[in-house]
């Protein structure tokens, strides 16, 4: 029972985590304009991995995609790659773990096969979570570096005649979503790996083999060796766990005939 619960919970936690990683990757608020120096701005800038957006005084939000590949910073490309790898690994992990779930019967699949699949999906979830955490952390580090660089530029080299306030960017909501989602995927992966240990067959009975020694009529039967993983019992109780993640996008402006790009 405990193994099924651990496996099911691991699956659900990973599912929520991967949905979060996908949401974070798609979100536009990876970096948002720091309003500390300009709290009264009517034009609010924020940026994602794929496009940058500007919310204007009319409430209209204009987003423009990064239509260049070579012109983008290497760090941004690296973050994109990490997030995509995380999503791909997570998606494959989910697919594998569905078939590995103890509560789902697929033909005559042995417990040892399910254990292997559970371990595989667990490792995939762990790597997926690490990719997401790494991607978000690299971006956050990039933001911190740029923030202090622009702060230094703001107060030097202008001879006191500061007319243009340089836009500084701070952490956006997507970073926090990414960190939490990566953490959840990682935890889910660890839970799957733990469940795997309990899924391995509890007993391996070896068939008795007769050894006939010449001149002796003695049969030697080796005793049954008990193989134990030490983690929980292999129960037949079936429990279905359901889980999901839902994200809401509150960007309230949609292109209309009055919008100019």
């Amino acid at each position: 029972m405990a193994v099924t619960a651990c496996q099911g919970l691991g699956f659900v936690v990973s599912l929520i985590g991967i949905a979060g990683i996908i949401a974070a990757t798609c979100m536009d608020q990876w970096s948002t304009q720091d309003l500390y120096n300009n709290p009264v701005t009517a034009v609010f800038n924020y940026q994602g991995l794929w496009r940058s957006c500007v919310r204007e005084s009319s409430g209209f939000t204009e987003c423009r995609g990064y239509f260049t590949l070579l012109g983008l910073p290497a760090m941004l490309q690296a973050v994109r790659a990490l997030m995509i790898v995380g999503i791909v690994l997570g998606a494959i992990g989910l697919l594998v773990s569905i078939f590995a779930l103890k509560c789902i019967r697929i033909g005559s699949m042995e417990d040892s096969a399910k254990a292997n699949m559970t371990l595989t999906s667990g490792i995939m979830f762990i790597v997926s979570g690490l990719c997401a955490i790494a991607g978000v952390s690299v971006f956050a580090n990039m933001l911190v570096t740029n923030f202090w660089m622009s702060t230094a530029n703001m107060y030097t080299g202008m001879g006191g005649m500061v007319q243009t306030v340089q836009t500084r960017y701070t952490f956006g909501a997507a970073l926090f979503v990414g960190w939490v989602a990566g953490g959840l995927t990682l935890i889910g992966g660890v839970m799957m790996c733990i469940a795997c240990r309990g899924l391995a067959p509890e007993e391996t009975n070896y068939k008795a083999v007769s050894y006939h020694a010449s001149g002796h009529s003695v049969a030697y039967k080796p005793g049954g060796f008990k193989a134990s993983t030490g983690f929980g019992s292999n129960t037949k109780n079936k429990k279905i766990y359901d889980g999901g993640a839902r994200t809401e996008d509150e960007v309230q402006s949609y292109p209309s005939k009055h919008d100019y790009v």
Epitope: V40, T41, N45, S57, Q252, S253, S256
Partner: antibody
């Protein structure tokens, strides 16, 4: 087509309040902020503030805080501006404006404060 | 608050002549996020509401005659009417659309000589 239709002219006594309405049509009401601007006779334009019809969020010019209150009714796509404690210097034409770059303005509402 | 200073206060030009209106802001109106200057020009005819002419300092609103053009960046902006027509008699306002409170220039009255 897009229209912002304001309520008619008002004549009020000093100390009274007035509520001016602005009905929007021809576009998705919750997609754009509705701003208000004051134009005193023969004078320039002064920004009063805006309301976000999507979530009722408001922002005011410091000068008009306590003087103007913006509200909205999404069911009728109407925004209201209430001016309190009227004085003679509040006599002006008040405009509501919306859409990108304020491409559309109401026809204006003349509020006259006279004893 | 950003102060918008328009000059001249009034301008009398002959039909077909060029009219130039200047607008200066006390702070830059250039948004680094999209490299656009958030300065807007409006035309107000007597007894009417202002009408949008130019946004982003130089982009003409659809339906506005091409004799109207805007230029400038940062803090200095110009509205030019290349060949003034009788229907261009109006007051022209520039507006800071970059920072709250949104502020307007004092206006420039264009008349025919």
């Amino acid at each position: 087509q897009v229209q912002l239709v304001q309520s008619g002219a008002e004549v009020k006594k000093p100390g009274a309040s007035v509520k001016v309405s602005c009905k929007a049509s021809g576009y998705t009401f919750t997609n754009y902020f509705v701003h208000w601007v004051k134009q005193a006779p023969g004078q320039g334009l002064e920004w009063i503030g805006y309301i976000n019809p999507y979530n009722d969020d408001t922002k005011y010019n410091e000068k008009f805080k306590g003087k103007a209150t913006l509200t909205r009714d999404t069911s009728t796509s109407t925004v209201y501006m209430e001016l309190s404690s009227l004085r003679s210097e509040d006599t002006a034409v008040y405009y509501c404006l919306s859409l990108r770059f304020f491409a559309y303005w109401g026809q204006g509402t003349l509020v006259t404060v006279s004893s | 608050d950003i102060v918008m200073t328009q000059s001249p206060d009034s301008l009398a030009v002959s039909l077909g002549e060029r009219a130039t209106i200047s607008c200066k802001s006390s702070q830059s109106l250039l948004n680094s996020g999209n490299q656009k200057n958030y300065l807007t020009w409006y035309q107000q005819k007597p007894g009417q509401a202002p009408k949008l002419l130019i946004y982003w300092a130089s982009t003409r609103e659809s339906g506005v005659p091409d004799r109207f053009s805007g230029s400038g960046s940062g803090t200095d902006f110009t509205l030019t009417i290349s060949s003034v027509q009788a229907e261009d008699v109006a007051v022209y306002f520039c507006q800071n659309d970059y920072s709250y409170p949104l502020t307007f220039g004092g206006g420039t009255k264009v008349e025919i000589k």
